[in-house]
């Protein structure tokens, strides 16, 4: 297993609809054809794999299970979007990238993006 640098933004604020997007960029040492991206959440004394996708370079990301994530890839960048977030989902979201094929296997883990989610205030009753 060889180490690889992964960069991601330090802070992202989710939209009022609970959607957060950020870019995960990795310094690929070679020409990987198969890449696996995992988003981990570290908060509340838990480490959770939020979503994971394996993709062939140039193709769409295919996420596993009932994923709350979507994403696209462009070169050594992965554009990730997490949906359905609520205030209690605020936490550190870490991007983990694995170059699966061809060998050698490379692993890179980012420092994490602190995603802040603020639940929208309910609209006040109107007389109009």
């Amino acid at each position: 297993c060889k180490a690889m640098h992964v960069a991601q933004p330090a802070v992202v604020l989710a939209s009022s609809r609970g959607i957060a997007s950020f870019v995960c960029e990795y310094a690929s040492p070679g020409k990987a054809t198969e890449v696996r991206v995992t988003v981990l959440r570290q908060a509340d004394s838990q480490v959770t794999e939020v979503c994971a996708a394996t993709y062939m370079m140039g193709n769409e990301l295919t996420f596993l299970d009932d994923s709350i994530c979507t994403g696209t890839s462009s070169g050594n960048q992965v554009n990730l979007t997490i949906q359905g977030l609520r205030a209690m989902d605020t936490g550190l979201y870490i991007c983990k990238v694995e170059l699966m094929y061809p060998p050698p296997y490379y692993l890179g883990i980012g420092n994490g993006t602190q995603i802040y989610v603020i639940d929208p205030e309910p609209c006040p009753d109107s007389d109009f």
Epitope: R41, A43, T48, A52, L64, D66, S67, L85, M88
Partner: nanobody
């Protein structure tokens, strides 16, 4: 409805390993998130680990990361908790639980609908 039966608990020495099993009944097992929780006498039930319906995604309490591994076999309707490098503070009753909800960044106790009876794990120093 899902019935859950845990097994594999026992008395071990600190540093030893143990594998807990949870047998589930019900035809829709593969659509449930499965989790392991633990509770010591007089304490709140505590999250240990969870696994998504397909087994692709997992979640762990910080206190067990790197020591415990959760896995599942949907064909056999089984969930496992492999526990390594056990510590006296791991002594607890361990419960298997099932939740029919989408995978979340924040698996929580309140989302679980079905619970087993528990299996005792005792780690002596």
């Amino acid at each position: 409805e899902v019935q859950l039966v845990e097994s594999g608990g026992g008395l071990v020495q600190a540093g030893d390993s143990l594998r807990l099993s949870c047998a589930a009944s019900g035809r829709t097992f593969s659509s449930y998130i499965m989790g392991w929780f633990r509770r010591a006498p007089g304490k709140e039930r505590e999250f240990v680990a969870a696994i998504s319906s397909s087994g692709a995604l997992t979640s762990y309490a910080d206190s067990v990361v790197g020591r415990f591994t959760i896995s599942r076999d949907n064909a056999k309707k089984m969930v496992y908790l492999q526990m390594r490098s056990l510590k006296p503070e791991d002594t607890d009753v361990y419960y298997c639980a099932a939740a029919r909800v989408p995978w979340s960044p924040r698996p929580s106790l309140s989302t679980y609908d079905y619970w087993g009876q528990g299996t005792q794990v005792t780690v002596s120093s």
